[in-house]
Interface confidence: medium
């Protein structure tokens, strides 16, 4: 604390402004400005990342305005140093005690690569089993003590229910953060908008996203599905394939049935929707099959879901790996 | 001109800096420090983006040092508007003359997400036209002065070929750059390293990419070709579809040919390689074919060109819009 | 002013595993910098073996690649160098550094005083 | 790897000695203008201590006897006036590329 019979300095450092295209200039000039205080013998020191500098500073002469006194002191650096994103510190000694500033280059205010999509219900969610879900999806997040803030809004000023949030270190060491928030089916089917907020103290600004139901024509899929004959080698193994083609928009949910039970998403591979020549688009399942399964029962089902399906949404097809038999 | 009888301004702006994190305080303040002129009056408007701003500027009074003053003016700014890139300008009116200085915030030094890829020969360039090539493939690099450089060169020391170079200006307004370099067949069989070497000026480092034969098992593709039948309101077209799987490594080219001819690869869509359950890739192939084709000649054959197939790294199944007739 | 402490070095016999720590004082790691390990073999050169970035993201020099992993515990303010599969070709000073960077190019500027790890049976 | 080549491997010199130190990379550590070559300086039993960055940018708080030149593949440090304290070990380091790479290093003795 300091005693009362002197009115301490204030030090704060300003710096020299990039140019009106955004450039740093070739050097940087830091001015530190230690002022308001009861003129006496004042010290300053440069630091650079916390290390004494053996430095020219063409500190100015001290100034007096009324009772108080003002010094500044200044820095000179390269580019290189500064752009080296050292921490240039001014420490002022006075009557015994210190004050600081410290700065160094301003972190990058559009850090690299930080995404946010927003997407849409799955079809199976939304027609099957009536509890759709939309999910906000933030990756390359740098990992730090700043918090992701994922907020849910509706065009209609409605209130949003209740999300759920997921945070996943990536083996890169970024964050991928996700929040799934549920949506009334018929909000959905009505065409309501949905938005996700993303704001974190590294990113520059907030990222707004929004989804509502595709626009445009719509138009059912085709379903067709086939058995790979048997190959050498691989004579208790089948591939079972399912082309779905030329629906529309793009959104599609795609199962495997055997035995009136949905087979597990992870047993079966499906393609991202691509376009076709013409309007809609396509996807193709592939299902590998075990003798034990065809044995059972050798008949499988491709199901696709869909919002231009009739009736339910849905189409369907079998398929045998011996339908002959 | 200034005439002789003053000594003109100069005009420099200062700005508050960011903490010892490189965070930015929650405002900013500008100091456009108006040095060195013959005492006179002087005029000082800042400027925002071009246009004058109306602000409560806080201009110190003037100083006096010897025969020459100075003054200061200071604007304060909320870091929202200082994030959001505009350019900030003191104009200085003086004796019928105008002095200025610009600044904005400095553009990041670590631009975001430049990124760079290095492909392998195709197997159809390999083993059938027997002339390979690799690309090196930049994208997100924000358009400029400096040159985006991509040299080649051999981890053998070898000397490399002439590259071709492609730039495309991109939708979103990023700039796109290839290099594709022809590769000696058997330099790349027998194992040739080639690296592609990525610099630029607004690039932080060189970006360096490598590309060899891939190591690990082999294993020759499957092929199975399927025809789907007639759909209603369709009967004039046909989808033709092609399953190419448990193949290693996952190197593969797809070409569909009719009457013996190479179809383009325009008219057919290939997925990208996926992992299948074990340890080999599958593809889809889908080719939409005409009623004028099949009634020409009622045979299509997938063709797959991968370097375990045999004979002369060659798998093919022809297919039958109507087998039967 | 920032200053680094190694600790964990000793006898390990072949095929054994150590812990190097750093503990950093003056400066939170998680502000800034390249975190690093450097060794020196008796009486041999240097040779930089790994970093963890400010942003956790890590570099390992491909002769270690696979047998060394480099972390760190921000609450403790520390980073650390986990050695596995230790041969006698590991037997060095191991050194912590923090690294300056400038556009992603990074150099040793302050070091820690070492840890001597000997691998023999 | 860029491979870095010092000599000599040690030399012997006297107090107020003009000393030059060379170090020559396997491919250029240039970039941009930028010279990435650093030099450091060991004494026996103590960590390396960072004197000169950028090929040419004396270290903060750094004798200005000490300086270093070169570009490319060619790097030199040199002592102008070789003082008692500077007997000891020296090493360049390239950080152009991963993984960054000392030179073998140069023992300075006594004469």
């Known amino acids: 604390v300091c005693s009362r019979d002197f009115t301490p300095p204030t030090v704060k450092i300003l710096q020299s402004s990039c140019d009106g295209g955004g450039h740093f200039p070739p050097t940087i000039q830091l001015l530190c400005l230690v002022s308001g205080y009861t003129p006496g013998t004042i010290n300053i020191t440069w630091l650079e990342d916390g290390q004494v500098m053996d430095v020219d500073l063409s500190t100015a002469s001290t100034t007096q305005e009324g009772e108080l006194a003002s010094t500044q002191s200044e820095l000179t650096l390269s580019q290189k140093h500064w752009l080296s994103d050292r921490t240039y510190t001014c420490q002022v000694t006075y009557q015994g005690h210190t004050f600081e500033d410290s700065t160094k280059k301003c972190a990058d205010s559009n850090p690299r690569g930080v995404s946010a999509y927003l997407s849409r219900p799955s079809p199976f969610d939304l027609f099957i089993r009536k509890s759709p879900t939309i999910t906000c999806l933030v990756v390359d997040l740098a990992p730090s003590k700043g918090t992701v803030n994922l907020t849910w809004s509706r065009a209609s000023g409605k209130p949003v229910n209740h999300s759920t949030r997921k945070e996943e270190k990536q083996r890169n060491g970024t964050l991928t953060v996700t929040s799934t928030l549920p949506v009334g089916t018929r909000d959905w089917i009505e065409g309501e908008t949905y938005q996700c907020r993303v704001t974190h103290p590294h990113l520059p600004r907030a990222l707004m996203r929004s989804t509502t139901k595709t626009s445009g024509p719509r138009a059912a899929p085709e379903v067709y599905a086939f058995a790979t004959p048997e190959w050498p080698g691989s004579r208790d193994k089948r591939t079972l394939a399912c082309l779905i083609q030329n629906f529309m928009p793009e959104d599609i949910s795609v199962q495997w049935l055997h035995n009136e039970v949905q087979l597990p998403d992870a047993r079966h591979s499906t393609t991202q929707p691509r376009k076709t020549k013409g309007s809609g688009f396509f996807v193709f399942s592939r299902l590998e099959v075990t003798r034990a399964e065809w044995e059972q029962k050798d008949e499988f089902i491709c199901r696709a879901v869909h919002e231009a399906a009739s009736p339910s949404q849905t189409v369907q097809r079998a398929v045998s790996v011996n339908p002959g038999k | 001109v200034c005439s002789r009888d003053f000594t003109p301004p100069t005009v420099k702006i200062l700005q508050s800096s960011c903490d010892g994190g490189g965070h930015f305080p929650p405002t900013i303040q500008l100091l456009c420090l108006v040095s060195g002129y013959t005492p006179g009056t002087i005029n000082i408007t800042w400027l925002e983006d071009g246009q004058v701003m109306d602000v409560d500027l806080s201009t110190a009074s003037t100083t006096q040092e010897g025969e020459l003053a100075s003054t200061q003016s200071e604007l304060t700014l909320s870091q929202k508007h200082w994030l959001s890139d505009r350019t900030y300008t003191c104009q200085v009116t003086y004796q019928g003359h105008t002095f200025e200085d610009s600044t904005k915030k400095c553009a990041d030094s670590n631009p975001r997400g430049v990124s760079a890829y290095l492909s392998r020969p195709s197997p159809f360039d390999l083993f059938i036209r027997k002339s390979p090539t690799i690309t090196c493939l930049v994208v997100d690099l924000a358009p400029s002065k400096g040159t985006v450089n991509l040299t080649w060169s051999r981890a053998s020391g070898k000397p490399v070929n002439h590259s071709t170079r492609k730039e495309e200006k991109q939708r979103n307004g990023t700039l796109t750059v290839t290099s594709t370099l022809p590769v000696g067949t058997r330099d790349w069989i027998e194992g040739e390293t080639y690296q592609c070497r990525v610099t630029h000026p607004h690039l932080p480092r060189a970006l360096m990419r490598s590309t060899t034969k891939t190591s690990g098992p082999r294993a020759a593709p499957e092929v199975y070709a399927f025809a789907t039948p007639e759909w209603p309101g369709s009967r004039d077209k046909r989808t033709l579809a092609c399953l190419i799987q448990n193949f290693m490594p996952e190197d593969i080219s797809v070409q569909w040919l009719h009457n013996e001819v190479q179809l383009p690869d325009a008219r057919h869509s290939t997925t990208q390689p996926r992992k299948t359950k074990g340890s080999g890739f599958f593809v889809f192939s889908r080719l939409e074919v005409t009623r004028a084709e099949w009634e020409q000649k009622d045979e299509f054959i997938c063709r797959a060109v991968h370097e375990a197939a045999s004979p002369s790294q060659t798998v093919q199944r022809a297919v039958s819009v109507n087998p039967g007739k | 002013e920032v200053q680094l402490v190694e600790s964990g070095g000793g006898l390990v016999q072949p095929g054994g595993s150590l812990r190097l720590s750093c503990a950093v004082s003056?400066?939170?790691?998680?502000?800034?910098?390249?975190w690093e390990w450097i060794r020196q073999a008796p009486g041999k050169g240097l040779e930089w073996v790994a970093s963890i970035h400010y942003d956790h993201s890590t570099n390992y020099n491909p002769s270690v690649k696979g047998r060394i992993t480099i972390s760190r515990d921000d609450s403790k303010n520390t980073f650390y160098l986990q050695m596995n599969s230790l041969r006698a070709e590991d037997t060095a000073v191991y050194y912590c550094?923090?690294?300056?960077?400038?556009?992603?190019?990074?150099?040793?500027?302050?070091w820690g005083q070492g840890t001597l790890v000997t691998v023999s049976s | 790897d860029i491979q870095l080549t010092q000599s000599p491997s040690s030399l012997s010199a006297s107090v107020g000695d003009r000393v030059t130190i060379t170090c020559r990379a396997s491919q250029s550590v240039d970039y941009h203008g930028d010279s990435y070559m650093n030099w450091y300086q060991q004494k026996p039993g103590k960590a390396p201590k960072l004197l000169i960055e950028w090929g040419s940018y004396l270290r903060s708080g750094v004798p200005s006897r000490f300086s270093g030149s070169g570009s490319g593949t060619d790097f030199t440090l040199t002592i102008s006036s070789l003082q008692p304290e500077d007997f000891a070990t020296y090493y360049c380091?390239?950080?152009?590329?991963?993984?960054?790479?000392f030179g073998q290093g140069t023992k300075v003795e006594i004469k």
């Open positions: 003056g400066y939170s790691i998680t502000s800034g910098h390249r």
């Open positions: 550094a923090r690294a300056t960077h400038y556009f992603g190019h990074h150099h040793f500027a302050v």
């Open positions: 380091q390239q950080n152009a590329e991963d993984p960054y790479t």
